[in-house]
Amino acid sequence: ATKLTEEKYELKEGQTLDVKCDYTLEAFASSQKAWQIIRDGEMPKTLACTERPSKNSHPVQVGRIILEDYHDHGLLRVRMVNLQVEDSGLYQCVIYQPPKEPHMLFDRIRLVVTKGFSGTPGSNENSTQNVYKIPPTTTKALCPLYTSPRTVTQAPPKSTADVSTPDSEINLTNVTDIIREQKLISEEDLEQKLISEEDLHHHHHH
């Protein structure tokens, strides 16, 4: 099996985490995708998910989290805006493939948020003066409840939607975007686990 790996990102309060989960395969394009936090000794908790079927280039906002699925490039963009210290933790992207186990996209993200702001002298993050506006056209999606008998280390999500009413617009200044790429699980593992095209086809959104 593919070894679970982490990438660590250290940010200041108020900054934005901007990650790209690379799901690569067309079969996954319209599958529902989720952003989860993994706390020690607990099952993964879904913080936000795309619609089902996942819509192309259609932002979904849950509180300070914005998901945007780009089918044509096989990328799920996840933004966590206005980061708080309590956002620190281990995160992952997954693809829902009910009734089968979700596929986890590697690598996991170890987010460390510290006090201060991006303009703090000595910070290794470059501050920017951009104002980030999250359009009011974003929607919320209901995330499925999904439990699994697997061990936590294999990251099966037990999804409970953490839904809060999003602001119609969020303005952020002095934001540093940390851009990263996520890798798909190994091709060998995927070939064994990949759900059939027939099963996927009813999820396809035209």
Partner: antibody, heavy 121, light 111 residues
Framework: EVQLVESGGGLVQPGGSLKLSCAAS????????MHWVRQASGKGLEWVGR??????????YYAASVKGRFTISRDDSKNTAYLQMNSLKTEDTAVYYC????????????WGQGTLVTVSS | DIVLTQSPDSLAVSLGERATINCRAS??????????LHWYQQKPGQPPKLLIY???NLESGVPDRFSGSGSGTDFTLTISSLQAEDVAVYYC?????????FGQGTKLEIK
């Protein structure tokens, strides 16, 4: 081991037709888009077109130079991709390669050895 | 269509020296700072071989003397210490937009 084997090349007269095949093995064929790339003797590489998977309704895309004359298709049950070439021109003379990408808009990691198509009277 | 222009068209470098090939795109080949630009090596009578994908990622099995850099419209393939077996034609290719396109190629020879 991933293998791509092209066949069907040969000599054809201008205005004629030819159908190339690409037999794939060593991977789940239905999961990946398949592409055709050609190369005239002593010249550079030219992307011909691609066909996506069933999940994308087998959508096809072509280079302007072949659009309307060439058609890419696939038979997932036979693990084979095809390039139907009609109204052939002398400038279509080239080695035609079948390639497989690594996913949506990803790199061409696997190539066949190519098959030569000669359009001449 | 996105046009990729490689420079130089041909290049002669001494063994052990650094070789640099540039590829300029007529428009950005990035999506979210994710460059859909790849490099291939082709030797006579053989199909192309993938060297670098997404601008800077070394393909498995490719010697680490090969490296790629750049983003947006300007990209570079570098061979840090030229070996005899590196004599070939090198192509850049973009997959950010249809139609996919290749650069015209750069012929690398030993000086």
């Amino acid at each position: 081991e991933v293998q791509l084997v092209e066949s069907g090349g040969g000599l054809v007269q201008p205005g004629g037709s030819l159908k190339l095949s690409c037999a794939a093995s060593g991977f789940t064929f239905s999961t990946y888009a398949m592409h055709w790339v050609r190369q005239a003797s002593g010249k550079g590489l030219e992307w011909v077109g691609r066909i996506r998977t069933k999940s994308s309704n087998y959508a096809t895309y072509y280079a302007a130079s072949v659009k309307g004359r060439f058609t890419i298709s696939r038979d997932d049950s036979k693990n084979t991709a095809y390039l139907q070439m009609n109204s052939l021109k002398t400038e279509d003379t080239a080695v035609y390669y079948c390639t497989r990408d690594m996913g949506i808009r990803r790199q061409f990691a696997y190539w066949g050895q190519g098959t030569l198509v000669t359009v001449s009277s | 269509d996105i046009v990729l222009t490689q420079s130089p068209d041909s290049l002669a470098v001494s063994l052990g020296e650094r070789a640099t090939i540039n590829c300029r795109a007529s428009e950005s080949v990035d999506t979210f700072d994710y460059s859909f630009l790849h490099w291939y090596q082709q030797k006579p009578g053989q199909p192309p071989k993938l060297l670098i994908y997404r601008a800077s990622n070394l393909e498995s099995g490719v010697p680490d003397r090969f490296s790629g850099s750049g983003s947006g419209t300007d990209f570079t393939l570098t061979i840090s210490s030229l070996q005899a077996e590196d004599v070939a034609v090198y192509y850049c290719q973009q997959s950010n937009e249809d139609p996919y396109t290749f650069g015209q190629g750069t012929k690398l020879e030993i000086k």
